[in-house]
């Protein structure tokens, strides 16, 4: 699986999970969140050559077909696999909330 | 949706629908499929600008982030969100087969 | 559960100004953003510009033309649009994602035309 376990230890130039620390404050202009500070939201990216962790069929074929035809510009992208929620501590007036703020973190990747 | 209905129909810079015509034997070097001769399998391109059908909290937080960011290369991608089946006839010596392959054909595309 | 209502549009020659004003209605709380998009005929919407607690982005067309102004005691969003183009008609829509949930207004035409 193409996740920190395998991409944070590989220097790897083809489609692999990256690290992004985002702060809210700094990086997004966001003060309203409590806690966390910020996190580990991660990306993807790198290059999908033939049958780098294909995801679908399709993929599959259009990876196959850059191959065949270099000069072709339909090649599959390097895209999230598994993402998991992250949970929130907020305040409305002086009452804190807290919330779980689905689909924030990048686990993997894959071409797609 | 980013779909051939809006795609085809609009020249779109952003994220869309393409239309690919795969010829097997010439595009993929695949002898063996008697029928059909090609089909059009479609990809998906386009740049992801903020908020451009953006897929997941995460692509939307990242689409954020890279407005507010420019200089980050941190960018969702632009990928297959509907797939059909292609349904193919071949042999087996003399013996026709039918067959459905799966996740073949790309209807409509989104930002990841 | 969020309401937003834009005012402020109209028809306007080219070169002039315009101010569009969202006024957002029920319990705002957790801004991921707020924002003015719009939509011309036959295209996608688009975003004209966006605003966080303390960050704004302008699309490139727009830049150092549109201004974008937030007041939250009021829960009020602006855009300030001078040297208006032919190429800035659309309808214009407000935009607030709380939690990581759209709101939209119904939108406001404006039409520059001489």
């Known amino acids: 699986a193409l996740d920190a376990a395998y991409c944070f230890r590989n220097v790897q130039d083809n489609c692999c999970l990256r690290p992004l620390y985002i702060d809210f404050k700094r990086d997004l202009g966001w003060k309203w969140i409590h806690e966390p500070k910020g996190y580990n939201a991660n990306f993807c990216a790198g290059a999908c050559p033939y049958l780098w962790s294909s995801d679908t069929q399709h993929s599959r074929v259009l990876s196959l077909y850059n191959t065949i035809n270099p000069e072709a510009s339909a090649s599959p992208c390097c895209v999230s696999q598994d993402l998991e929620p992250l949970t929130i501590l907020y305040y409305i007036g002086k009452t804190p909330k807290i919330e779980q703020l689905s689909n924030m973190i990048v686990k993997s990747c894959k071409c797609s | 949706a980013l779909d051939a209905a809006y795609c085809f129909r609009n020249v779109q810079d952003n994220c869309c629908l393409r239309p690919l015509y795969i010829d097997f034997k010439r595009d993929l070097g695949w002898k063996w499929i008697h029928e059909p001769k090609g089909y059009n399998a479609n990809f998906c391109a386009g740049a992801c600008p903020y908020l451009w059908s953006s897929d997941t909290q995460h692509s939307r937080v990242l689409s954020l982030y890279n407005t507010i960011n420019p200089e980050a290369s941190a960018s969702p991608c632009c990928v297959s969100q509907d797939l059909e089946p292609l349904t193919i006839l071949y042999y087996i010596g003399k013996t026709p087969k039918i067959e459905q392959l799966s996740n073949m054909i790309v209807k409509s595309c989104k930002c990841s | 559960q969020v309401q937003l209502v834009e005012s402020g549009g109209g028809l306007v020659q080219p070169g002039e100004s315009l101010r569009l004003s969202c006024t957002a209605s029920g319990s705002i709380f957790g801004v991921f953003y707020m924002g003015w998009f719009r939509q011309a005929p036959g295209k996608q919407r688009d975003m004209v510009a966006i605003s966080t607690d303390d960050r704004t982005s302008y699309a490139d067309s727009v830049k150092g033309r549109f201004t974008i102004s937030r007041d939250n005691a009021k829960n009020t969003l602006a855009l300030q649009m001078n040297s208006l183009k032919p190429e800035d008609t659309a309808v214009y829509f407000c935009?607030?994602?709380?939690?990581?949930?759209?709101?939209w207004g119904p939108g406001t035409q404006v039409t520059v035309s001489s």
């Open positions: 935009n607030l994602n709380q939690l990581g949930t759209d709101y």
